[in-house]
Interface confidence: low
């Protein structure tokens, strides 16, 4: 037999938060355990789930699990079924809601002297106890002009009036927690004497020495005051108005007129009326002076046809917002077609090249009228007038590549030179018709140019083939001067270049036969061995049949190259004595000699009284200090070549000489004594 | 085949910064300019910036000072830094290619449309609230 082990029990359970409804039964065999509730099976929800054979509840709900529970153990090989006592939950709960009139039927039928019943739709249970308040402030039950009935969690103000307006909220508790009213009621009971306004003043905006008028009317019983201030709290009257408001005018029925306004009018005026009870009523308005400002200037336009595009005007600042329309020709643009106006836009679809002109942007409010033009071009696309040719430059000279384009708006010609972008330098030069002017034609020059113009349209482009005509010249030029070592072979090279190949040939300047020993071999000159009578001026003659020829002269000297008889030698002195440093070269040209001190010509002219360069060539330096050492070169040149040769110098303080050395001894170094 | 592919879009706090980045694929990236342009819902596109194949930086006046476009080739990738963003920069970003032969100072100012330039890629949306 299934026995309950555990059976659920009715228990109290608070709304939201956890319950368990606990079951436990003991079977000789396997059973299955499920709940009902109010007979029907209960399915696991994520709130409300079996946990083991209890039922669990995450979140208790006053509506849900309201009913009766009961827990079924069946056995199902059997058939054999059990079922738990009856169990349920007294759920303790409350709700929020407004205050709500009750009594009379609508806010329109409340009158001074009537009664007035307002419910608070707060719920619970167990049933809660209400707390009314009046604009925050507790009412408690008995005072006078009202009842408060807990049962009905009603109040009533009998009879109710001007004292009771206010805002009505309600506040229950119980034993679950407290609630307060989600909603609030506002009670306005008039009281015939307090002031209410009829006619309230608006804010105003009028241009300079304009008129502007504020109306203000309040009504009571009696009638109420009615007194006009100005932004300074100074009062307005017909019989006492502050200087600055000289033209202000007050109306028996409350409207405030203000002439010729100036800017010193403009702020806030205020219109305070006061009835014989209660609060004074004070409505504000402001007195605006219209005012516009300048409007930005537009950029001009670029446009292809065929396009749509939109030009928007960005209105001035002004006050009031200036209202913005568009021109063109003279003529206010319509809201629809195809050139049109769409808000503050300018619109043109489906552009056409007849669109091109000049639009206008018009401003304007109670301050005045402002106007901004726009200059719309229409890009066509850029025609030929004259295309590159393929042309033949001559070199060093010059050239010149058209490309000649016509097209709105002017186009833009870029030069590209094997696919490279030309940039302009000292070289080439685009001017403004699109002409590329190459300033010195080089041999290289000759390849291909395209050239490219271009508007927003769009673009076309050519390309022509540039064949540089070389100039006749020697490549390079031979030098003016040269000279040749005696008793030496020598050789004298002279090539050129030209549209033709050249043939090239040498001959003495006087017109005589080169000697026997002396050969020309494709231009260049070879002596066997130099002898003196091979020194002379000698010509390079290049020639091919369409440039003619070109000479080139050269003046051959013939010498003796130079050598050193005495050269400088490593010299170590003594501080204060004399150092000779010797150098003595022959050549011919009989070669001069130099010398080099530490990094520098020693010019003979400014060497001072310590140093002198004999005719030999020799160097002396007198009273040497330390600051002499270093390196010195001898340097011997002639009008053929230079030639030269160094040796180190040192300066040392000398020895105090030790008993050990005898006398005589040598000093550890070559040292030059004086 | 030819594919512009924008990344680096979401969300920011106005004051903030973004860095959008388009990487371009099947053309020759160098010989083309770049451009940069947004669409705000039921707006137009808007074009905000340009750096051309030499490049030559342009920008549109709502962006001046605040946005700055650079490119690098080796990556052929373009870059849009956004800072000092607004809620009014709320948009869907678009990368555009350009082969054409009109300078692309004309072509900033005149010309809207998705017609007016030769690739796009698919947008990344950038969201700025206060």
């Known amino acids: 037999a299934i026995v309950f082990i555990k059976q659920p029990s009715s228990q109290d359970a608070l709304q939201g938060r956890r319950a368990l409804l606990r079951c436990e039964v003991e079977a000789p065999g396997p059973v299955h355990v499920y709940w009902l509730l109010d007979g029907a099976p209960v399915q696991d929800t994520e709130r409300r789930f079996a946990q083991g054979s209890s039922l669990s509840f995450a979140a208790v709900d006053r509506l849900q699990d309201s009913g009766t529970f009961q827990c079924v153990a069946r056995d199902d090989v059997t058939g054999e079924e059990a079922r738990s006592a009856n169990a349920s939950f007294n759920i303790k709960w409350i709700e929020a809601g407004p205050v709500v009139l009750k009594h009379p039927a609508s806010e329109a039928e409340i009158q001074p002297q009537t009664q007035v019943t307002l419910r608070c739709h707060i719920d619970g249970h167990p049933r809660p106890t209400y707390q009314w308040f009046r604009d925050g402030t507790p009412l408690s039950d008995g005072q006078s002009n009202h009842t408060v009935s807990s049962k009905e969690r009603n109040l009533t103000l009998r009879p109710a009036g001007p004292e009771h307006s206010g805002l009505y909220s309600c506040c229950a508790h119980s034993a679950f927690g407290q609630a307060c009213s989600s909603q609030n009621f506002t009670l306005s009971i008039a009281d015939e004497s307090f002031a209410r306004v009829v006619l309230a003043p608006q804010d105003v905006v009028v241009a300079r020495y304009e008129e502007a008028m504020f109306h203000c009317q309040f009504s009571a019983q009696p009638p109420p005051s009615l007194q006009w201030l100005f932004e300074d709290e100074t009062p307005i009257t017909n019989r006492s108005r502050p200087p600055h408001l000289r033209r202000a005018t007050v109306f028996a029925n409350g409207s405030l007129l203000l002439t010729q306004v100036r800017p010193r009018n403009a702020g806030i005026y205020r219109c305070i009326g006061q009835g014989q009870r209660g609060p004074p009523i004070i409505l504000e308005a402001t007195l605006h002076l219209a005012e516009i400002e300048d409007m930005p200037l537009f950029e001009p336009r670029v446009f292809t046809a065929g396009s749509e595009e939109r030009v928007t005007c960005l209105p001035p600042k002004g006050l009031p917002e200036p209202s913005v329309w568009w021109e063109h020709a003279g003529v206010r643009l319509p809201t629809h077609g195809r050139v049109y106006q769409k808000g503050h836009e300018l619109v043109l679809a489906n552009i056409a090249e007849s669109d091109a002109g000049v639009y206008t942007c018009h401003a304007a409010n109670l301050a005045g009228q402002r106007r901004q033009d726009v200059n719309i071009t229409v890009a066509t696309v850029p025609s030929w007038l004259k295309k590159p040719q393929d042309s033949q430059l001559e070199e060093g000279k010059p050239g010149y590549l058209d490309c000649l384009t016509q097209a709105t708006p002017k186009p833009t010609v870029v030069w590209y030179r094997n696919q490279m972008l030309i940039s302009e330098d000292s070289r080439f030069e685009v001017f403004k018709n699109g002409t590329l002017r190459i300033n010195s034609v080089e041999v290289y020059d000759g390849t291909w140019y395209r050239c490219m113009s271009s508007t927003p349209a769009g673009s076309i482009e050519a390309q022509a083939r540039v064949q540089v005509l070389e100039k006749l010249k020697f490549t390079p030029p031979p030098q003016p001067q040269q000279c040749m070592e005696f008793d030496k072979e020598a050789t004298v090279p002279c090539s050129a270049t030209g549209r033709e190949k050249p043939t090239i040939k040498w001959e003495r300047a006087d017109g005589s036969s080169l000697p026997e020993w002396v050969t020309d071999n494709a231009g260049t000159l070879h002596f066997a061995r130099v002898t003196r009578d091979d020194a002379g001026n000698y010509t390079c003659i290049a020639s091919n049949g369409p440039q003619g020829q070109i000479r080139a002269h050269v003046q051959l000297t013939v010498a003796v190259f130079i050598t050193f008889k005495v050269e400088p030698e490593r010299t170590t002195v003594y501080q204060g004595h004399t150092a000779l440093l010797q150098c003595e070269a022959q050549g011919d040209p009989k070669p001069l000699i130099q010398w080099k001190g530490k990094d520098r010509i020693l010019d003979p002219t400014k060497l001072g009284p310590r140093m002198h360069i004999f005719q030999n060539g020799s160097l002396v330096i007198h009273d040497v200090a330390p600051e002499d050492s270093g390196r010195y070169t001898c340097i011997a040149g002639n009008s053929c070549n230079i030639k030269h040769t160094e040796a180190p110098l040192y300066v040392v303080d000398k020895p105090v000489p030790e008993e050990s050395e005898g006398p005589g001894s040598p000093p550890p170094y070559k040292m030059i004594q004086t | 085949q030819v594919q512009l592919q924008e990344s680096g879009g979401g969300s920011v706090q106005a004051g903030g910064s973004l860095r959008l980045s388009c990487t371009a694929s099947?053309?020759?990236?160098?010989?083309?300019?770049m451009v940069w342009y947004r669409q705000a819902p039921g707006n137009e596109y808007e074009w905000l910036s340009t750096?051309?194949?030499?490049?030559?930086?342009y920008y549109a006046d709502s962006v001046k000072g605040r946005f700055t476009i650079s490119r690098d080739n080796a990556k052929n990738t373009v870059y849009l830094n956004m800072s000092r963003v607004k809620p009014e920069d709320t948009a869907v970003y678009y990368c555009?290619?350009?082969?054409?032969?009109?300078?692309?100072?004309?072509?900033?100012?005149?010309?809207?449309?998705?017609?007016?330039?030769?690739?796009w890629g698919q947008g990344t949306q950038v969201t700025v609230s206060s």
């Open positions: 099947g053309f020759t990236f160098d010989d083309y300019d």
């Open positions: 750096v051309s194949r030499g490049g030559n930086l």
């Open positions: 555009a290619a350009d082969l054409r032969s009109v300078p692309s100072t004309y072509r900033a100012r005149t010309c809207r449309g998705r017609y007016c330039r030769d690739y």
